[in-house]
């Protein structure tokens, strides 16, 4: 007698392996025997498909060697004519052992900035990321995380940092190592110790001594009044990565002798410059304090910038501070000709406080750095873009030079004026577009190092600065 | 919120020492200079010590040399060591915060230097 | 040395009115275009608290019938609207040269 088609093994849940068989079966009762049709994400497969095998009738699907795009929901269709057509249907859940699609390089990174190291994966279930520094796992922290992609995120690199790193990637099937890759921490050139002035009479020997580190460990070179020393010996030795040189004079004439420390990074260099006086007896003119002191301001590229007239912080840790800060200066403002003019106005002001701080007042001259809450408005609002394009390009190495790095203030160590308004300065001068004006968005915190607190009003500082936000 | 909290003031006899500590929370007080004021009983203010970030102090001429003002950016404390008290150091000591004006005050600790 | 002078020691004054404190600096205050002058007020059995820094900024929270004006040497803190709250000993300092100074103070007291 004719009978309607019935599924008496109904289809399940099939796990399988990357590049393994799986099948599928769906066995079937009827007569006359039925027409058996299998269909992938309600997709007909095609008989003469080569990666399937069709046997039993149809009864039987196998997938030859199984691709991760393989997953889905596979039914089985049954009909002879007889009543109507019945159907099953089961997943197919691709398992795979770990791999690693994107491996961790090696990388380069200058001290105090982000490193990251990437390590992306495939795998089901979702493999968990780990990584190995030399010979024991990575611990994170509240500069090193392990990010959602499986990366290793390290903030403010440390000396400490530099080693060996691989990733381990790990599921229920097994575990994937990455190669081992190597962080190599650059350090900027810095000046340990300072050649130091001397008063002396004609015809002594002086030994101006200068101590410097880095990494890679810089080299030394000895100006005098401008120029390359062409009198003196010169003795180095390096030990553990520091650089001493000691320069041995006989005194004729005064003069100002310049320490300068340089070493390399790809294809920047960075320096760092400590001058001395030498001064006979007779002479002698008064010594400026060895921080620094307070000027007016005699440049032109933060003329608009800075308030007429401001006494400004010039630091004698240059040989020629007006000169050395204005070049800082100078070269920054080239990196923000590309800027949007919501950005642009506000990060020159920022800059050129920050270069050229200003002074208070007191026995010795202090500079006054900038208020944290004005440094997060730039960097969070009206640059936010630019300056995760400018840590992005930092990271790259993509900057001709070193010097913008330190004009961009680092915005969480300065002081807040919402704890102490005379700790810090205002930035004033930012004053662009006046028309259409909102209120900056208030986003008070108890923890202002976090947050950009409002910046109060004031009759006297005025901070207008986007055609969306004003700050007074 | 800003909270300086003085402690180390008591009883003492003329010549001899004590140490106040003032607590601080509420903000990073390595970035923010520090002071000492005091208020004789029924007297006003009378400004102390100021300690800047980098630990570089300054004195009233009427404590140099017995007062000593220090900082611990770790454990957030300021701290005024008193030597040689005269009895008209007795007053109430105020730990305070700010550059160059007074901006937030603690409640004060009371020193009394007396035989 | 600063020496600030301030008058007069004491004031007496109803609700509503208005009252002006002196403070006369032995000499200037002014540095880079700011005057490092503040006022505090201390109401009794309380620390100070900052009303004025800079000689004309208002600290956020202090109500805006206080205001401070002045340049150089001499310098005014004033009440447009005395209240009963404004009860307290009023004080300047200099913040211009270590050792800061303070004025002798002003007793403010209502009618």
């Known amino acids: 007698l004719p009978k309607a088609p019935v599924i008496t093994t109904p289809l399940e849940t099939v796990d399988a392996l990357v590049e393994e068989v799986a099948t599928f079966m769906c066995a079937v009762e009827s007569y006359p025997q039925p027409e058996i049709s299998w269909t992938r994400n309600k997709i007909l497969i095609k008989l003469f498909d080569t990666r399937y095998s069709i046997r039993e009738n149809g009864q039987l699907l196998t997938i030859l060697s199984v691709e991760d795009s393989d997953d889905g929901i596979y039914c089985c269709t049954a009909n002879n004519g007889v009543g109507g057509a019945v159907e099953s249907c089961g997943a197919l859940q691709v398992k795979m052992k770990p791999k690693i699609t994107r491996p961790p390089i090696n990388v380069k990174i200058i001290e105090g900035l982000k490193a990251v190291l990437p390590c992306t994966t495939m795998g089901n279930p979702k493999p968990s990321v780990s990584w190995i520094k030399g010979d024991s796992p990575l611990r994170e922290n509240s500069r090193i995380a392990v990010l959602e992609s499986g990366s290793l995120r390290i903030h403010n690199v440390q000396k400490e940092d530099a080693g060996q790193y691989r990733c381990v990637a790990k599921n229920s099937l097994g575990t994937a190592y990455s190669k081992v890759v190597k962080l190599e921490v650059e350090v900027f050139a810095r000046i340990l110790r300072a050649p130091e002035s001397h008063n002396v009479t004609f015809g002594s020997f002086v030994t101006l001594h200068c101590t410097a580190t880095g990494i890679p460990v810089p080299t030394i070179t000895w100006i005098e009044n401008g120029n390359a020393v062409s009198s003196g010996s010169i003795q180095e030795s390096v030990k553990d990565r520091v650089i001493d040189s000691r320069l041995q004079l006989f005194i004729t004439k005064p003069g100002l002798y310049t320490c300068i420390a340089t070493n390399k990074h790809g294809e920047k260099f960075s320096t760092a410059k400590a001058a001395a006086t030498i001064s006979i007896a007779e002479w002698s003119k008064p010594q400026k304090d060895n921080k620094g002191y307070c000027a007016q301001y005699r440049g032109e590229v933060c003329n608009a910038v800075l308030a007429k007239d401001a006494l400004v912080f010039l630091n004698t840790s240059y040989a020629d501070p007006e000169e050395a800060q204005e070049l800082l200066v100078h070269t920054a403002w080239n990196e923000l000709k590309v800027v949007s003019p919501v950005c642009r106005p506000a990060a020159e002001a920022l800059l050129c406080n920050h270069i050229f701080q200003e002074c208070s007042p007191g026995v010795v001259p202090t500079p006054i750095p900038i208020c944290r809450e004005y440094c997060l408005a730039v960097k969070e609002l009206f640059c936010a873009k630019e300056w995760l394009v400018m840590e992005e390009k930092t990271h790259r190495g993509l900057y001709r030079s070193e010097m913008h790095l330190l004009s961009v203030p680092e915005c969480s160590k300065l002081p807040s004026m919402h704890w102490d308004p005379t700790a810090c300065a205002r930035l004033p001068h930012l004053d662009y577009n006046k028309e259409n004006l909102k209120t900056f968005p208030p986003m008070t915190s108890s923890k202002p190092s976090v947050d950009i607190p409002n910046l109060p009003s004031s009759s006297s500082s005025s901070f207008s600065v986007s055609p969306t936000y004003s700050m007074t | 919120e800003v909270q300086l909290v003085e402690s180390g003031g008591g009883l003492v006899q003329p010549g001899g020492s004590l140490s106040l500590s003032c607590v601080a929370s509420g903000f990073t007080f390595s970035l923010y200079y520090m002071n000492w004021v005091r208020q004789a009983p029924g007297k006003g203010l009378e400004w102390l010590s100021v300690i800047d970030t980098h630990s570089i102090a300054y004195y009233a001429d009427s404590v140099k040399g017995r007062f000593t003002i220090s900082r611990d950016n770790v454990k957030n404390t300021l701290y005024l060591q008193l030597n040689n008290l005269k009895p008209e150091d007795t007053a109430l000591y105020y730990c305070v915060l700010g550059r160059t004006a007074l901006v937030r005050w603690g409640q004060g600790t009371q020193v009394t230097v007396s035989s | 040395e600063i020496v600030l002078t301030q008058s007069p020691s004491s004031v007496t004054a109803s609700a509503g009115e208005k009252v002006t404190i002196n403070c006369k600096s032995s000499?200037?205050?002014?540095?880079?275009?700011?005057?490092?002058l503040a006022w505090y007020q201390q109401r009794p059995g309380q620390s100070p608290r900052l009303l004025i820094y800079?000689?004309?900024t208002r600290e956020s929270g202090v109500p805006d019938r206080f205001s401070g004006s002045g340049s150089t040497t001499d310098f005014t803190l004033t009440i447009s609207s005395f209240q009963p709250e404004d009860v307290a000993v009023y004080y300047c300092?200099?913040?211009?040269?270590?050792?800061?100074?303070f004025g002798s103070g002003t007793r403010l007291e209502i009618k």
């Open positions: 800079w000689a004309s």
């Open positions: 300092q200099q913040g211009y040269s270590v050792p800061y100074t």
């Open positions: 000499q200037s205050v002014l540095y880079n275009q700011k005057n490092y």
